[in-house]
């Protein structure tokens, strides 16, 4: 069979080889398509409801005024010329529709390096057969499930027209130190050959590189955290990050009910102030980061170092924040 591709909605003429150019003709067309149950026979006499779908022209050709999806199938013509020689024509008709230019919707203007990001959703509407969507990054095709690339695809078919809408959502994990302004594009490749790919306008999101927070330093004064009763301890939380994060304080693993501050002053130390202290820095773009813990203890007169163990008591005493 000869393969014929026809665009949906456009006319199609199939020649009946060997048929006399004008009546009287001995020919018949047989169709097996989505409109027929088994084979439908059409003759030059025509007439009836089929004339609006397909009719035999005076020269024996079959004319379809507007091809539809249901017209995909096999078309055969059997004709006898004036000398009684029989000729057969056999066509396999496939139909297509080129969609509108694909578009990227919900596109991100900024991506974060090192974590998965949604780049955008590529949408192609009105294709037949469905075809495929593919993504490119800086001239290279992106392969799903490789190097932090994932693609969620969805194909919907219009209940009335039978045309396809394709959606492809791209997620990527940009490498740290990679291209700061990558170019993504999406293209539609048709399901039938001979019809060129269609491509979206490219998008160029910026890649934001999160600066790894340097370690949170906790400085204690006096050094070592051992102080005589009634003395003062100053705890300072040093965070190099900019802008300055919020600093909260913990004692024995429990947050202290105090407003954020980088300095914690413990004046007039009493037994209830003994324990393990740490600070927690919370940056707007990072999770919380905790410092090392330091132990604050009371030295009784005559002792040279911190007392063994810590004295109980949950009172905060007279706590001051700088």
């Amino acid at each position: 069979a000869q393969n014929i591709t026809a665009r949906i909605g456009e006319p199609l003429v199939l020649k009946c080889k060997g048929a006399p150019k004008k009546p009287p003709q001995r020919l018949e067309w047989k169709l097996n398509t989505g409109r027929t149950e088994a084979w439908k026979v059409l003759s030059p006499q025509g007439g009836g409801p089929w004339d609006s779908v397909a009719r035999v022209l005076p020269n024996g050709s079959l004319f379809l005024p507007a091809v539809g999806i249901q017209d995909e199938g096999i078309f055969r013509c059997q004709a006898m010329n004036r000398n009684g020689k029989e000729t057969k024509s056999n066509y396999r008709v496939r139909v297509y529709q080129i969609p509108g230019k694909p578009e990227i919707v919900d596109s991100a203007s900024e991506l974060t390096a090192g974590v998965p990001n949604k780049v955008g959703t590529c949408v192609s509407e009105g294709s037949y057969p469905a075809g495929t969507l593919s993504w490119h990054l800086d001239g290279k095709p992106l392969v799903p499930n490789e190097k932090g690339v994932s693609v969620k695809e969805q194909t919907r078919r219009h209940p009335e027209t039978g045309l396809f809408t394709l959606q492809s959502e791209l997620m990527v994990t940009p490498a740290r130190g990679g291209d700061p302004r990558p170019t993504f594009s999406c293209s539609f490749s048709p399901g039938l050959p001979r019809h060129r790919a269609l491509r979206t306008a490219p998008i160029q999101p910026r890649v934001w590189e999160p600066v790894p927070l340097e370690e949170v330093q906790l400085v204690v004064e006096p050094e070592g955290g051992a102080v005589a009763p009634g003395g003062t301890v100053t705890l300072t939380c040093e965070v190099p990050a900019q802008p300055s994060p919020q600093i909260h304080w913990m004692k024995d693993g429990v947050p202290l009910p105090l407003p954020p501050s980088p300095v914690l002053i413990l004046p007039e130390i009493g037994p209830q102030d003994q324990g393990t202290y740490s600070c927690v820095a919370t940056h707007s773009s990072h999770g919380p980061q905790e410092s090392r813990a330091v132990s604050i203890s009371i030295i009784e007169p005559g002792e040279e170092g911190p007392t063994a163990g810590s004295v109980g008591g949950s009172g905060l005493g007279t706590l001051a924040l700088a």
Epitope: R181, S189, R196, A197
Partner: antibody
Amino acid sequence: QVQLQQSGAELAKPGASVKMSCRASGYTFTDYWMHWVKQRPGQGLEWIGFINPSTVYTEYIPKFKDKATLTADKSSSTAYMQLSSLTSEDSAVYYCARSDGGWYFDVWGAGTTVTVSS
Amino acid sequence: DIQMTQSSSYLSVSLGGRVTITCKASDRINYWLAWYQQKPGNAPRLLISGATTLETGVPSRFSGSGSGKDYTLSITSLQTEDVATYYCQQYWSTPYTFGGGTKLELK
């Protein structure tokens, strides 16, 4: 109309460097990528790499990574290619060609001939 | 990298005749194939993109076909001005690669 105007022929000594230009006109320079292609006398076409003038992203084939440097000046709509540590193997015609993103090369410059000779 | 192979480096042709130039990719390129014509002393000129789409101003005697890895450029009724070297190029993935070229020579 759309044009890519390349600089004139270069004669250079082995070990030297040359910098050639490709001036774009008739379209928005940052909307298209600029590619460079090498053709040695009597030989075929060899893609060197491209620059995206909008983002200044560049890509080279490995053999040209240390040989070619692609740059672009948006203000003058000009792309440049510098070739360093020249040898006789670098004697060739170098073409610039534009593409709409990662697409075919629809407009080409006339080429710059580089001759490396002592 | 995707390799492009043009099986004939030279083709001996007759004016008015039909010419077929073939190009094979080492991997599927999804119809992302271009054909260029180059005449001596000139820059290449784009003839066909998307494997089959003729560029504006290119005579209709040129046509492109193929799919998957195999592609063809055809010239019917060859004219004197068609005597040139023809290159295929894939732009499915960087590094973009050209075929070795096919030079047409008059018989």
